[in-house]
Interface confidence: medium
């Protein structure tokens, strides 16, 4: 379907790109000596960029430094140093810069105070970093500024003495609504959800912390939860790791109503050692990966049903280390139900798998075309490619990005990988697939920084390397072609490449330094590709293109989680701009029922390579840990349940008789009858 | 504690060599350039030469030019100047210094080494 | 290169007046790039402003920093026994590195 990358030549040579470039180039100095650059994007479509320099010299019993803020309204083309709006205040780089939800335009930057100060010191910003207004905190904030999502005025933070500190009036005044508070965080319709210690603290009341829920910015309370030892949200499920009575084990509850009722999740408990993770989720369902017994580095991934109650076995195995908490889990983002991840075999080598269909399947991901099998292969001509992500770079491995997809680049991946048995410690390559993870080739060789503008439009690129750059690469068809541009005569240490969220933007900044004996110069590079992609792509640039599509005789051929979809995509040899306003144009059609589209309730199982669900064997001599909303039910069950998100109409009803399974409630976490209310007076 | 030491100064007759260490404790040696100062008895401060911390990027001053060669060894945390063709008015107090961040000015001075050339 | 000329070369107060000394560049220096060291006979410089502006750690607050361009200034608000040494002026922007002649500050 494609060949094997190209640079320079062979290609489709784009005319008088160099000219074009160099005059879209713009160059900026950052006059200060900081030793370390932080960047953050203000708003959508905005061009406002703030960076944070700061320049640090730690010491035994303080530190020391200054800060310089520097602001772009043009997207990284040229800075203004706006440090005096910051009345040239040391800003804490460990906060960072707290900026507001949407296109608010809120930015707060936390400061350094001296020792004996009675709290903290801010500076917000509404207007998109134009102004900032100092503000002296009643407090001594412990983490980051948290926004409301529903509100940008309303903000949280937690204190080094753990009170929980809510505005309604973005900062300006503070008032403490709750001590003893471990972790806080925001639900939806502006409810703050927290854990407080009854006794001692945090750390020692861990699996005896209190769960509680305010709706109204802390005037009210209702204790939703005992004997926590965590909480989390995930799409519409809110979740909690609860203490078993017995022993010292822990248990996840579901609840979909705020924490008003709570199911018990059909999942194994976890020891003291062990832990839960939540993968991904979304409004339907919830990826769970449950820890295994012992410091073994893997798990077991669960996909829910859209209670978040009834889970299925996904994979064995699931790479997720105890100690760094590294998992190689990725959503791949340009294309619905396709995930990526790591397993570890049985002699501790690492293996990428992949699933189409939300967890329902998972399989190697496919060799490239010509590539050839590396050493750790058996059978050199039978192999895959592993994919590295998280754990890789953890490990200091030479892999400068995890992979990268977004969702108005459709079907686009972009990984470093090998091509084996399993994933290589010798230096990775980059490889693209155009299709969503089903077929691959070699993009670039060896470890690349990459990046994706206007929409899969253009794929820029920077060399990994110990050595000064002065290179960029860039694509306009997907990473076949290659052109290299030399963007700067004097070669700059690289630290990153930096684009606007959302890959929409025709704009990549280049960051790096200049060192020489003397000092370091802090610098960035911003190319605006524009005038590349001269003409707006118009109807003749795009081809229609069935998504999931692997046996295009079948007439099922696309069909995951019940519906297909055709996307209308930029053809490769087209160089158009796709252009800021370009929304993904998507057909679906419904696709009638099977088997596949559902799974097994409770109390029923799949046997291995069959499809359809059987009871379990009366799961005899014990009683079923059960309990859905607090208490004993009767549960009635055809045996299947669709798959969260699923669409299919018609086809195969799996209909049968309806069972009553009587179980007995096990759970004797929060009935009802146990919550109470409190009003903060 | 952040330490400079240098060592390897004494007598020496013009036209001869000498080399100079400087031995750095208490910081990440490798993530600073470093330099040598010199003083004259009596005199001012003038700077000799600097190293970054890769050894990349040299720099020298000009009445030292083409006779000083500087040089480090970061796995041993330590700073070098080798000194050929010494002349009377290369008598001084040398300093070697770290930076206070990867660039600027030098926050920390070792106590100096006496070098006297003299016939 | 970039010459710093200091004035005056001697200054000759007493103890809880204020001190200022000059350092005047040869050509434009960017203010990140300028700092002052104290000397004391027998004994290594220490370092007191960088940034043209900015205090060392634990240089007391009587001694300030300003200016930009050319034209740069230390201030000692009030001089303490202690103050009392040769200051230099240094300019780290381009290479050479290079620092001025030096101020004596000695009791009048």
């Known amino acids: 379907r494609r060949g094997a990358p190209a640079e320079d030549q062979d290609c489709g040579r784009l005319p008088d790109f160099i000219a074009k470039l160099t005059n879209n180039t713009h160059q900026h100095v950052f006059d200060d000596l900081s030793g370390s650059v932080s960047l953050s994007w203000v708003g959508d479509s905005t061009g406002v960029i703030l960076v944070l320099t700061t320049f640090q010299v730690p010491l035994v019993i303080v530190s020391f430094g200054q800060s310089k803020l520097y602001r772009s309204e043009d997207y990284g083309k040229n800075f203004k140093d706006i440090t005096n709006l910051i009345n040239n205040t040391f800003i804490r780089t460990e906060f960072g810069m707290a900026i507001g939800p949407e296109n608010s335009g809120k930015v707060i930057l936390t400061a350094e105070v001296s020792g004996g100060s009675r709290g903290g010191r801010v500076f917000r910003s509404s207007d998109f970093a134009k102004n900032f207004v100092q503000t002296d905190l009643p407090f001594h904030p412990l983490t980051q500024m948290m926004y409301s999502p529903q509100n940008s005025d309303y903000l949280l933070a937690l204190s080094t003495e753990n009170g929980l500190w809510v505005s309604k009036n973005f900062g300006e005044k503070w008032e403490e609504i709750h001590k003893a508070v471990c972790l806080a965080k925001w639900g939806p319709n502006n409810i703050i959800f927290f854990t407080t210690h009854v006794n001692g603290s945090c750390k020692a009341d861990l699996g005896a912390l209190e769960l509680w829920r305010t709706s109204d910015l802390g005037k009210t309370f209702k204790t939703i939860g005992v004997k926590i030892y965590s909480f989390g949200l995930g799409g519409r499920f809110l979740f909690a790791s609860v203490m078993a009575d017995k022993d010292t084990t822990r248990r996840i509850h579901v609840s979909t109503d705020q924490g008003d009722t709570w199911s018990m999740a059909q999942l194994p408990s976890v020891g003291q050692e062990q832990f839960y993770s939540i993968l991904a989720a979304n409004e339907d369902m919830v990826f769970m990966h449950v820890d295994e017994p012992g410091d073994t580095g893997f798990g077991t991934i669960f996909t829910s049903d859209d209670r978040g109650i009834v889970y299925s076995k996904s994979l064995d195995r699931h790479l997720y280390t105890t100690t760094g908490g590294e998992t190689d889990f990725t959503n791949v983002t340009s294309l619905r139900g396709v995930y990526i991840t790591s397993t570890l075999s049985e002699d501790n080598s690492i293996q990428s798998m992949i699933t189409f269909d939300q967890g329902g399947r998972w399989e190697h991901l496919r060799k490239p075309e010509n590539s050839k099998c590396d050493a750790t292969a058996k059978n050199k001509n039978e192999c895959s490619l592993h994919i590295h992500a998280s754990y890789s770079i953890s490990q200091k491995l030479n892999v400068p990005m995890a992979p990268l997809s977004e969702p108005n680049a459709v079907g686009i991946v972009i990984a470093h990988g090998s091509v084996g048995d399993a994933i290589s410690v010798m230096v990775p390559d980059v490889y693209i697939s155009d299709d969503g993870g089903y077929s691959w080739a070699k993009m670039l060789e060896g470890p690349h920084y990459y990046t994706i503008l206007d929409s899969g439009g253009i794929i820029v690129a920077i060399e990994h390397s110990n050595r000064p750059i002065n290179v960029i690469k860039f694509s306009t068809d997907e990473g076949q072609c290659w052109q290299s541009y030399v963007f700067t005569q004097e070669p700059i240490y690289f630290t990153g490449l930096a684009s606007e969220p959302g890959a929409r933007s025709m704009n990549i900044s280049i960051w790096g330094f200049t060192e020489s004996f003397i000092t370091r110069q802090w610098v960035s590079y911003t190319v605006d590709f524009k005038d590349i992609l001269e003409r707006n792509c118009e109807e003749d640039d795009y081809t229609t293109w069935l998504a999931h599509s692997t046996d295009p005789g079948d007439y099922k051929d696309g069909c995951i989680l019940g519906y297909k979809e055709q996307f209308l995509r930029l053809r490769k040899s087209s160089v158009c701009q796709n252009g800021r306003d370009y929304v993904v144009a998507k057909q679906p059609s419904v696709c009638p029922c099977s088997l596949e589209d559902f799974l097994c309730d409770f109390g029923y199982f799949r046997p291995e390579n069959a499809s359809e669900c059987v009871e379990q064997p009366e799961l005899k001599g014990h009683e079923l840990e059960f309990c859905l909303y607090g208490k004993e039910e009767h549960l009635t069950t055809n045996g299947y349940r669709k798959i969260p998100g699923d669409k299919c109409q018609g086809g195969m009803n799996p209909a049968r008789e309806v069972k009553d399974l009587k179980k007995k409630c096990t759970s004797n976490f929060l009935n009802p009858t146990k919550q109470n209310s409190k009003s903060n007076s | 504690e952040v330490q400079l030491v240098e060592s390897g100064g004494g007598l020496v007759q013009p036209g001869r060599s000498l080399r100079l260490s400087c031995a750095a404790s208490g910081f990440t040696f490798g993530d600073y350039a470093m330099h040598w100062v010199r003083q004259a008895p009596g005199k001012g401060l003038e700077w000799v030469s600097g190293i970054s911390w890769n050894s990349g990027s040299i720099g020298y001053a000009d009445s030292v030019k083409g006779r000083f060669t500087i040089s480090r060894d970061n796995a041993k945390n330590s700073l070098y100047l080798q000194m050929n063709s010494l002349r009377a008015e290369d008598t001084a107090l040398y300093y070697c210094a770290k930076p206070l961040y990867r660039g600027g000015p030098f926050d920390i001075w070792g106590q100096g080494t006496m070098v006297t050339v003299s016939s | 290169e970039i010459v710093l000329t200091q004035s005056p070369g001697t200054l000759s107060l007493s103890p809880g007046e204020r001190a200022t000394l000059s350092c005047r560049a040869s050509q434009s220096v960017s203010s990140s790039y300028l700092a002052w060291y104290q000397q004391k006979p027998g004994q290594a410089p220490r370092l007191l402003i960088y940034?043209?502006?900015s205090r060392a750690t634990g240089i007391p607050d009587r001694f300030s920093g300003s200016g930009s361009g050319t034209d740069f200034t230390l201030t000692i608000s009030r001089l303490e026994p202690e103050d009392f040494a040769v200051y230099y002026c240094?300019?780290?922007?381009?290479?050479?590195?290079?620092f001025g002649g030096g101020t004596k500050v000695e009791i009048k």
């Open positions: 240094q300019q780290v922007a381009v290479s050479p590195i290079t």
């Open positions: 940034g043209a502006s």
